[in-house]
């Protein structure tokens, strides 16, 4: 039975040209995390394998940085980066847990972080 929950940074906003950290945290399970994938819509941005480490898609390597931890840093943000991001935790023996983050990239300098929320 899958007992874990993923806590994410929730709905967040950031300024155009700036950076943002996407973070997820898996809790309430003793399952071993074997890999975390970061996806935007249908695109795979990066993977972090427990043993082999980070592997960033060449399509995003200029604007994506690994970490902190299992999180992902997006740099040089554009309005086209607005949208849903997913952290996908591959675990053993539980299987797959998915967290969702919505990022809004704003033209203005008024960019506030949303509240944290949980996805069971």
């Amino acid at each position: 039975m899958m007992t874990g929950t993923i806590e994410t940074t929730g709905n967040i906003s950031a300024e155009k040209g700036g950076s943002i950290i996407l973070q997820c945290h898996l809790s309430s399970t003793t399952a071993q995390v074997t890999q975390v994938n970061w996806e935007q819509q249908d695109q795979l941005l990066a993977i972090c394998n427990a043993d082999l480490g980070w592997h960033i898609s060449p399509s995003f390597k200029d604007r994506v940085a690994p970490g902190p931890g299992l999180g992902l840093t997006l740099q040089s943000l554009t309005v086209n980066d607005t949208g849903e991001y997913f952290c996908i935790y591959h675990t053993y023996p539980d299987g797959t847990y998915t967290g969702r983050i919505f990022l809004e990239v704003l033209e203005s300098s008024v960019a506030e972080h949303g509240a944290r929320f949980q996805i069971p």
Partner: antibody, heavy 114, light 107 residues
Framework: EVQLVESGGGLVQPGGSLRLSCAAS????????MSWVRQAPGKGLELVAT????????NLADSVKGRFTISRDNSKNTLYLQMNSLRAEDTAVYYC???????WGQGTTVTVSS | DIVMTQSHKFMSTSVGDRVSITCKAS??????VAWYQQKPGQSPKLLIY???TRHTGVPDRFTGSRSLTDHTLTISSVQAEDLALYYC?????????FGGGTKLELK
């Protein structure tokens, strides 16, 4: 130039043990996760084991769990695969592989037969 | 586990031909696919990673592409030295798995 040189293969009876080694050079060994991949005669490729750059985390294929152990000595730039309770189906060429499979050694042959 | 199916175990070609080697994933693996070439008596060599990026030193006649769960390695003009075994691999989900291989041979 990246070089991975495996050794330690040979003929062993079922139930026996072997320890494979992989000597790495031409790159910063301690910065890379490493793997062992095997290829049975006339067959495809199977990922057997992986190990973190620091050695603190490892993963083993279900087919070898409880029998094989992967380890490394970063001071010696060497990767190991300890194989116990060997079976006929473990007969294969074993390759040492860097990181996300970008460089492979030449392989060492393990034959399990009575 | 994700199954990578290379439906053609053998493909016949001629020097100068364009050939496409296919691999179907049992579920969506996005662009987390690599292709390897293995010549007789040698170890596999990485050709393509992240579905379409050529590894260092790989000739530009080799290209990789993806359409949903179908992944393709194309050789635009086959050379004699390209006759070999080709394997796909997914690294979207652990355990990482390989296709069964496709042997490219002369007609």
């Amino acid at each position: 130039e990246v070089q991975l040189v495996e050794s330690g293969g040979g003929l062993v009876q079922p139930g026996g043990s072997l320890r494979l080694s992989c000597a790495a050079s031409g790159f910063t060994f301690s910065s890379y996760g490493m793997s062992w991949v095997r290829q049975a005669p006339g067959k495809g490729l199977e990922l057997v084991a992986t190990i973190k750059s620091s050695g603190g985390s490892t993963n083993l294929a279900d087919s070898v769990k409880g029998r094989f152990t992967i380890s490394r000595d970063n001071s010696k730039n060497t990767l190991y695969l300890q194989m116990n309770s060997l079976r006929a189906e473990d007969t294969a060429v074993y390759y040492c592989v860097r990181g996300y499979f970008d460089y492979w050694g030449q392989g060492t042959t393990v034959t399990v037969s009575s | 586990d994700i199954v990578m199916t290379q439906s053609h175990k053998f493909m016949s070609t001629s020097v100068g031909d364009r050939v496409s080697i296919t691999c179907k994933a049992s579920q969506d693996v996005k662009t987390a696919v690599a292709w390897y070439q293995q010549k007789p008596g040698q170890s596999p060599k990485l050709l393509i990673y992240w579905s379409s990026t050529r590894h260092t030193g790989v000739p530009d006649r080799f290209t990789g592409s993806r359409s949903l769960t179908d992944h393709t390695l194309t050789i635009s003009s086959v050379q004699a030295e390209d006759l070999a075994l080709y394997y796909c691999q997914q690294y979207y989900s652990t355990p990482y798995t390989f296709g069964g291989g496709t042997k490219l041979e002369l007609k």
